[in-house]
């Protein structure tokens, strides 16, 4: 295995609101990822960095600093919040996110996360880009796994 | 003083298995790694593997094909290795020791038990 | 695995005489932090192991300044520059940068 892992396991919550005027939703995303350490020292993890897309455009991000230090053999699960605002030439979302009639506002967003650690004066970056399901209409608190926009693509076992 | 203290000498039968115990005293308990090896009689040492008490996290030599099994319990300050489906190559002294580390770095195997003697006859 | 091939297989000696012991890896042992974790261990007839070197040529606490450990890349040596009576048993070099972490076959140094 690589000596370091990190794995994007998915979106936690989503929390929403809106700018009726200015026909703009806000969306604080949060996000859960698996970091772990198949070294025999410990780490540190100097910074995270994230961006989240929608239709190729770029909504949100947001960079963690000096966020842990991960022992060896060991994993450490971190959330990160990342603020987005669909707005502009995407104000044509506000229809559909507050729509009344429709139950759940899924729309998908791409998440890219970048995890940094240093190693003696190095830095050593791992990436990870996701798909995954949001609903812009509530606030919602997801299972882990359960937003990632593949798995819903997947016929039911 | 820094110890690990082993339980005795154990003789089992083939096919079942055994747990060997290693007690930690002297030292803080999660901030080393525990590792396991191994010495049949009349022969050299081999590397079991390794736990970290802390995390549970372990690493194995895979040659042993999943005979040894690691686990700590933090509060007892015991690393412990179960041993299954026992056969006479099994039979040996085994060994825990404690391994320091530190960001970026790791130190070695600065203190060992005195070794837990594992018989398998029938 | 890393084969760890050590020589002598027994190395004679009197006492006072200095001793050589050789380590070869069959492939790099640099981890990837760029240190070397190739360790020495001491064993005497009935007791566990004991430290001697770290990290190619750190003597442990305690160890004498008679025991010296030096290499690099895939070719490391112990030396022992007056050999003693306590000093007699089977010693060990160990690697510790790819899993599984291996030792070499032992060299018994006894008396001539």
């Known amino acids: 295995p690589r000596s370091i892992d990190v794995k994007y396991i998915g979106v936690k919550s989503a929390y929403v609101s809106y700018d009726v005027q200015k026909r703009t939703i806000y969306l604080n995303i949060t996000n859960t990822l698996n970091i772990t350490n198949n070294n025999y020292y410990s780490v540190e993890v100097e910074n995270i960095t994230a961006q989240v897309q929608f239709s190729k455009t770029v909504i949100g991000k947001a960079r963690l600093n000096n966020i842990t230090i991960i022992g060896p053999l060991d994993m450490k699960q971190i959330d990160y919040t990342v603020p987005t605002v669909i707005a502009e030439e995407m104000s044509y979302m506000y229809d559909f996110c507050t729509l009344i009639s429709i139950k759940v506002h899924n729309i998908v967003l791409m998440m890219q996360v970048t995890v940094t650690t240093t190693y003696f004066g190095h830095s050593e970056q791992i990436s990870q880009e996701r798909y995954q399901y949001v609903d812009c209409g509530r606030n919602t608190t997801y299972q882990l796994g359960q937003s990632e926009y593949l798995n819903v693509l997947q016929p039911q076992q | 003083q820094v110890q690990l203290q082993q339980s005795g000498a154990e003789l089992v039968r083939p096919g079942t298995s055994v747990k060997v115990s290693c007690k930690a005293s002297g030292y803080a308990f999660t901030n080393y790694l525990i590792e396991w090896v191994k010495q049949r009689p009349g022969q050299g040492l081999e590397w079991i593997g390794v736990?970290?008490?802390?995390?549970?996290?372990?690493k194995y030599n895979e040659k042993l094909k999943g005979k040894a099994t690691l686990t700590a319990d933090k509060s007892s300050s015991t690393a412990y290795m179960q041993l299954s489906s026992l056969t006479s190559v099994d039979s040996a002294v085994y060994f825990c020791?404690?391994?320091?580390?530190?960001?970026?770095?790791?130190?070695?195997?600065?203190?060992w038990g005195q070794g837990t003697s594992v018989t398998v006859s029938s | 695995d890393v084969l760890m091939t050590q020589t002598p297989l027994s190395l004679p000696v009197s006492l006072g005489d200095h001793a050589s012991i050789s380590c070869r890896s069959s492939q790099s042992i640099v981890y990837n932090n760029g240190n070397t974790y190739l360790e020495w261990y001491l064993q005497k007839p009935g007791q566990s192991p004991k430290l001697l070197i770290y990290k190619v040529s750190n003597r442990f606490s305690g160890v004498p300044d008679r025991f010296s450990g030096s290499g690099s890349g895939t070719d490391f040596t112990l030396k022992i520059s007056r050999v003693e009576a306590e000093d007699l048993g089977v010693y060990y070099c160990f690697q510790v940068s790819h899993v599984p972490f291996t030792f070499g076959s032992g060299t018994k140094l006894e008396i001539k």
């Open positions: 736990i970290n008490p802390g995390s549970g996290g372990t």
């Open positions: 020791a404690r391994r320091g580390y530190t960001i970026y770095d790791f130190y070695a195997m600065d203190y």
